[in-house]
Interface confidence: low
């Protein structure tokens, strides 16, 4: 095979937003037949040289940015895309409430609004299902989420956490669920 | 234009208890938190506490027992409460809007003596 | 609950001169700090947020910097109309006021 090998993917399991002292799997997967799997954590010096990462319960120092490759023979696969994998419950909850209400017609406007009592100015509002959130760095301890011309697909739950720039992947534990009704659809 | 405006009773007994209110203009406290401070005569401002939008409180902790803040929202007032008053809570009340305190009113004198 | 201690409690300076604040928190305050301005018979001025973010308005010759524990405030070419008292305020976990620095003018 000529160039580099593909990257191999890096997942983590159930989720890469993990509760503290619960635990997570890390596993990178590359194509079959494999010789030697890297997994590494991001500025830092730890790395292994396995495909699985089994972490029993969830630390800070563990929270942070990973990704790994493979070799075949003597060549080294490109690297994965990053995993960030946070640490959530580190810090109290936020509260997430909908403005003008959590029933909103079909064809309005809603805002969900996360707000905590401390001094944070990131914010990721996650709805049930959606595996990417929607981050938004605001106000420092608050943040709105517009939702602009509201459809039947923004029903569902949302919850959101707070964070700190300054240890991006050491965030809250998740705000009380809220529930999004869109009514006349 | 953002306006607070507090409003309380002055004189007030040792032992008693002291009601202020709060009345905002140009924003909604349904968006925005809002603080109580206060000033001795003679001494720096001390946060006494705040209401979020969403209606919970904050408290500072040695206050704590006997404070209560709350809020009508479609009146746009806050309402601050303290029980059991001493001669050395007199001080200037002041209000001021949400993180940190963008606006402030211009307080309103508050003496406790018999 | 955070402790800030502020520096010095009261100052004199010369118009077109340069004074410094300090204000030491009791733990890291991840530059969760403001810092006010408080003339008599009127209610505190937001100058300064989130350590050196000044407030629309606020002129230039205000500042601040600092990380951690650690922050200060400085005012430069002082003028006149800056006599009055400044205040930190940490937001980080609640809020606690530093003590209060008076200004005044030689």
């Known amino acids: 095979q000529s160039g580099p090998l593909p990257k191999p993917s890096l997942q983590a399991l159930p989720s890469s937003l993990v509760p503290l002292e619960k635990p997570v799997t890390l596993r990178c997967q590359g194509p079959p037949g494999v010789d030697l799997y890297r997994l590494e954590k991001l500025s830092s010096s730890r790395y292994q040289d396995q495909a699985v990462l089994f972490i029993p319960a969830m630390k800070r120092s563990l929270a942070g940015r990973y990704r790994c490759s493979y070799q075949n023979g003597s060549l080294w696969s490109l690297p994965s895309d990053q995993l960030e994998l946070v640490a959530t419950g580190v810090f109290a909850k936020p509260s997430l409430s909908a403005q003008p209400g959590p029933a909103v017609s079909s064809g309005g406007d809603v805002t969900l609004q996360c707000q905590t009592r401390y001094g944070f100015d990131q914010f990721a509002l996650y709805k049930e299902g959606d595996p990417a959130p929607y981050k938004n760095p605001e106000r420092w301890y608050r943040a709105s989420f517009p939702i602009i011309t509201v459809t039947a697909a923004h029903s569902g739950t949302y919850r959101c956490y707070s964070f700190s720039s300054r240890d991006p992947y050491l965030w809250s534990a998740p705000s009380d669920p809220l529930e999004l009704v869109v009514t006349g659809t | 234009e953002v306006q607070l405006l507090e409003s309380g009773p002055g004189l007030v007994a040792p032992s008693g208890s002291l009601s202020i209110t709060c009345t905002v203009s140009?924003?909604?406290?349904?968006?925005?938190?809002v603080n109580w401070v206060r000033q001795p005569p003679g001494k720096g401002l001390e946060w006494l506490g705040m209401?979020?939008?969403?209606?919970?409180?904050d408290y500072q902790s040695t206050l704590k027992s006997r404070l209560s803040i709350s809020k009508d929202n479609s009146k746009s007032q806050v309402f601050l409460k303290m029980n059991s008053l001493r001669t050395d809570d007199t001080a200037r009340y002041y209000c001021a809007r949400d993180l940190p305190m963008d606006y402030w009113g211009l307080g309103t004198s508050v003496t406790v003596s018999s | 609950d955070i402790q800030m201690t502020q520096s010095p409690s009261s100052l004199s300076a010369s118009v077109g001169g340069r004074v410094t604040i300090t204000c030491k928190a009791s733990?890291?305050?991840?530059?969760?700090i403001a810092w006010y301005q408080h003339k008599p018979g009127k209610g505190p001025s937001l100058l300064i947020h989130?350590?050196?973010t000044l407030q629309p308005g606020v002129p230039s010759r205000f500042s601040g910097s600092g990380s951690g524990r650690d922050y200060s405030f400085s005012i430069s070419n002082l003028q006149p109309e800056d006599i009055a008292t400044y205040y930190c305020?940490?937001?980080?976990?609640?809020?606690?006021f530093g003590g209060g620095t008076k200004l005044e003018i030689k």
């Open positions: 989130y350590t050196s």
């Open positions: 733990q890291d305050i991840n530059k969760y």
């Open positions: 305020l940490q937001y980080a976990n609640l809020l606690t």
């Open positions: 140009g924003f909604s406290l349904t968006g925005y938190g």
């Open positions: 209401i979020w939008g969403d209606g919970s409180t």
